[in-house]
Structures are given as C-alpha cells and as structure tokens.
C-alpha cells in the first residue's frame, strides 16, 4: 500500500545508519518529475537541511545543505540510473565521512558530510513520486 | 474533499473558456514547492503542451509550450501573488490572442497563443499541491 507524500518521519542518524526508500515516479521522464529527500535538523519542515537530495528524473541530481536558512554550494550530477516509469529502490548510507546513495543496488552518488549526521532529527520524502517503502535501519552496537 | 494529484481531465478549449483550480501548496515556500498546469494536445501525458504553467512558490513562474516533443522559448515572471501556506484560486481564461492567468482574482500573468487553444484535449494539474477544485467553463454559444 502507498505511504502519504510528502512523507515525514522522525529519525536519528549516525555512522552505519541506512535510509531505504522504494517508490515510482508519478510522470514520464519527458515531463521531468522530481523526487526529493531531505534530512532535517528539526521536526519542522522549515528547519535546516543536513542533506538535500533532489532528482529531476531523466535530467540530473542536485545535492546540497541548508544552514541557518541559507542554501550552500550545490553539487550536481548527470548520472541517471533511474528508469523511466520503473520502480526504484534508493538507499542512503551514512559512512564516516559522507553519505553514499545507492540506486537499485548500484552506488550512484556521494555527498561529504557538511553537518554532523547526528544533527538529523527528521527525514522527509516528497515531490512527484508514489512511495511504497520507507525504512531507517540502525547499526547494531 | 481532495482531488487526486496528478489530476488529469479531458477538456476542449476555445476563446471564452476558463479553467479554474483551487488548491494549496504542500510545503512552506522556503522549501520551494511547485505547481504545474499543462494543457496537452492528447490524452497522453507525453503529448505536446500548448500551455505549460509552472509555479515555483515564493520564487518565480515559468510558462512555455512543448511542440513536436521540444520545449520552446520559456517566459519567466518574478510576480508572486501566491501566499505562503494559503489556499489559492487560479483561473486561466482563453482570450482571443492569449491566456490570462488570474490568482485570487488578480490578473497576474499572460501568455500569447503559440498553438491554437482548440488543439487542447487534456489538462493536467500536478506537483506539490493539494487540489480541492478543478473546473472548465465553456462560453455559452
């Protein structure tokens, strides 16, 4: 069954955590649907963003952080492992020095930590997708 | 009650027709939610677009057409009559030479016809909004 979109969940992240998302674009790539995943510092959507991951399907991916309300330097990738009309599985793993983003099991993007992952309190998944799975797994201590 | 988004409806337009849309952004303007309204030439979403109207709430509006699969010259406006967190009523009227877009009763944007409005067969409303009303009114002959 489908999860509501925008989908918001409280989360605590640290090295070893993985956020897994399964979904499908709501439109054909010609129409450039978006997927966005934001790791927020508070439960409020207007809070700062430790890791902003935005896919413009068929075109590009941008990653960034929002600190003290201001967007910082954007990182852009033309790598596009997503398939038009197909379901995707996205996993974002917290490594010691960066986030590693896997798409359908394939390492596709990395983003160096600018803010400690421990600052994350909420994850939001939204824009032009249907969402079937959201999970945060924690490293067993 | 809410209409599904993306929302698609068959439509025939001509001078005097008005498309009315009522909705609300799904996120605060800081997070730049989008609203998109597309007037398509076929019932298929990959068809050409006679009038493409995209709002990046709080930032800008872009208008364009997609002809033979290719986007043409974009028209951009910084006019932003939409209010953060507030419901909006959008009406797009077909005038003899252009589309006139009203936001909350105020004339806000115009877009000259590039393709005959009679070519429109479908209207799609989508992206980051909740939708409470969609109506196409036809000029009484």
């Amino acid at each position: 069954s489908l999860l509501p979109v925008p989908y918001t969940e409280a989360a605590s992240l640290s090295t070893g955590s993985t956020v897994t998302i399964k979904g499908r674009p709501l439109a054909c790539f010609l129409n450039e649907p978006y997927l966005q995943v934001d790791f927020h510092t508070e439960m409020k959507e207007e809070s700062d963003i430790v890791f902003h991951f935005q896919v413009c399907f068929g075109r590009r991916v941008v990653m960034n952080s929002r600190e003290y309300g201001a967007w910082k330097q954007q990182v852009e990738s033309k790598n596009m492992p997503f398939q038009d009309g197909q379901e995707f599985e996205l996993s974002i793993s917290v490594l010691p020095d960066k986030y590693q983003v896997m798409v359908n099991g394939q390492s596709s993007y990395t983003f160096d930590h600018r803010i400690k992952p421990e600052a994350v309190k909420m994850v939001q998944v939204w824009r032009d997708i249907s969402l079937t799975k959201f999970n945060v797994s924690y490293l067993k201590r | 009650s809410l209409l599904p988004v993306p929302y698609t409806e068959a439509a025939s337009l001509s001078t005097g027709s008005t498309v009315t849309i009522k909705g609300r952004p799904l996120a605060c303007f800081l997070n730049e939610p989008y609203l998109q309204v597309d007037f398509h030439t076929e019932m298929k979403e990959e068809s050409d677009i006679v009038f493409h109207f995209q709002v990046c709430f709080g930032r800008r509006v872009v208008m364009n057409s997609r002809e033979y699969g290719a986007w043409k010259q974009q028209v951009e406006s910084k006019n932003m009559p939409f209010q953060d967190g507030q419901e909006f009523e959008l009406s797009i009227s077909v005038l003899p030479d252009k589309y006139q877009v009203m936001v909350n009763g105020q004339s806000s944007y115009t877009f000259d016809h590039r393709i005959k409005p009679e070519a429109v067969k479908m209207v799609q409303v989508w992206r980051d909004i909740s939708l409470t009303k969609f109506n196409v009114s036809y000029l009484k002959r």
Partner: antibody
C-alpha cells in the same frame, strides 16, 4: 605522503599586494573532496583562516578578508596562490598553506612549515 | 576576535589530566578539531571530527563535544605536551574558524 611548501617574498610594502604560492607534492590539488587553505598567524596571536580553493576550483574566503583576497591555482604545476591586496602592517604574519580533506569545516591534516611575511616600508 | 573562545592558559601537574575547553561553536552541527603548536613550528592535528585521533598521536589525547562546548582532554600529561592548543570548527560548511588558543603548562 603529501607535502605542502609555501614560497614568496618575506617583505611587502604597505598598500601593495602580497602574493604567496603553495606547492603540493605527493597528491593532486584536483583530487576529489580536498580543499587547500591559507591560514595565517600574526605575532603572538592565534590562527586565522584566510580562504581556500576546492578540488573543483571553487574559492571560499573569510568574510573579514574577502574584499582583499584572491586564491587561484595552477593545476599543471600542482600549485595554488594567495593574493592579498592593499596590505597594512596588521597583515604581518606567518602564512601557512594546509590541506583540509572533506570540506572546509573539517580539519587540516597537512601543513607547510610557514613563511614569514612582514609588511613594512 | 575569535568566534571560538578558549582559556588563554591552563596548567597541569605532570601525569595529571588536563582539560582545555572551546566554547561558542555550534558543535551540534559542526565537527571540532584540535591542533598542537610548539614554538617555531607549524600546528599539528591531534584530534579531528570531535574525537578522532590521527595515527602517531598518543592515546592520552582525546576529544568530545556537546552543544556549544568542545573539550580536549590530555590524560596523564607529559612534559612534551607543553604547547599552544587551538580548536577549530565551522561557522558554516563554507567558513572555518579557530579558537584564540590555550597555552598548556606542564608543572
């Protein structure tokens, strides 16, 4: 093993432009995610970050020195250069270049030995 | 003036524990690093990312941070630890700041 070495004139006249070069060996300045910084230490004072150039070529400057600072690079010689304009005696300091892996707010693991710059007429 | 505040001097008896604090940063957001500097030498990284210790740095050096305060701890201070210590962190991800420095005296 990465090594960084500063070079440049030890004496600069007031109002002139100070120019220092940092030569990097044992690693490329274009290697992903590394940032190459200039840091200075005035006599008897603490450390002050001046600015940096990223692996991508993008530059960052301390807000307090931004109007006078320019950092550029020469990838063929694996060097990056600091230019500080309109210097005054307050710019007298030991100038260090350093490597900061994984972002500006991270840490500096390799430092040059420093070069003394005196601003005096 | 430094965005990060350190005590100008700290004294410790040989073999005892020294603690040097660094205040005023947003250590909930940004990592803190610590550097040791001896006279006439370049700074040396002793702690990175709050509590990481580079290879070659003795185990007696450790770091922690909470809220707006970060602490460098030297357990069992040795004579060779006498030096100036600087904390460093971000004021945003594209700007970095240092503390004013602390002179550690080993008695």
């Amino acid at each position: 093993q990465v090594q960084v070495q500063e070079s440049g004139p030890g004496l600069v006249k007031p109002s002139q432009t100070l120019s220092l070069t940092c030569t990097v060996s044992g690693g490329s300045i274009t290697t992903n995610y590394f940032y190459w910084s200039w840091i200075r230490q005035s006599p008897g004072k603490g450390l002050e970050w001046i600015g940096a150039i990223a692996y991508s070529g993008r530059t960052y400057y301390s807000p307090s020195l931004k109007s006078r600072t320019s950092i550029s690079r020469d990838t063929s010689n694996n060097q990056f250069t600091l230019q500080l304009s309109s210097v005054t005696p307050e710019d007298t300091a030991v100038y260090y270049c350093a490597r900061g892996p994984k972002g500006l707010a991270s840490y500096y693991d390799y430092w040059g030995q420093g070069t003394q710059v005196t601003v005096s007429s | 003036s430094s965005a990060l505040t350190q005590p100008s001097a700290v004294s410790v008896s040989l073999g005892q524990t020294a603690r040097i604090t660094c205040q005023g940063g947003n250590f909930g957001y940004y990592y803190v690093s610590w550097y040791q500097q001896k006279p006439g030498q370049a700074p040396v990284l002793v702690i990175y990312r709050d509590s990481g210790r580079p290879s070659g740095i003795p185990e007696r050096f450790s770091g922690s941070s909470s809220g707006d305060t970060a602490t460098l701890t030297i357990s069992g201070a040795q004579a060779e630890d006498e030096a100036d210590y600087y904390c460093q962190s971000g004021s945003s991800s594209d700007n970095t700041v240092f503390g004013g420095g602390t002179h550690l005296t080993v008695l």
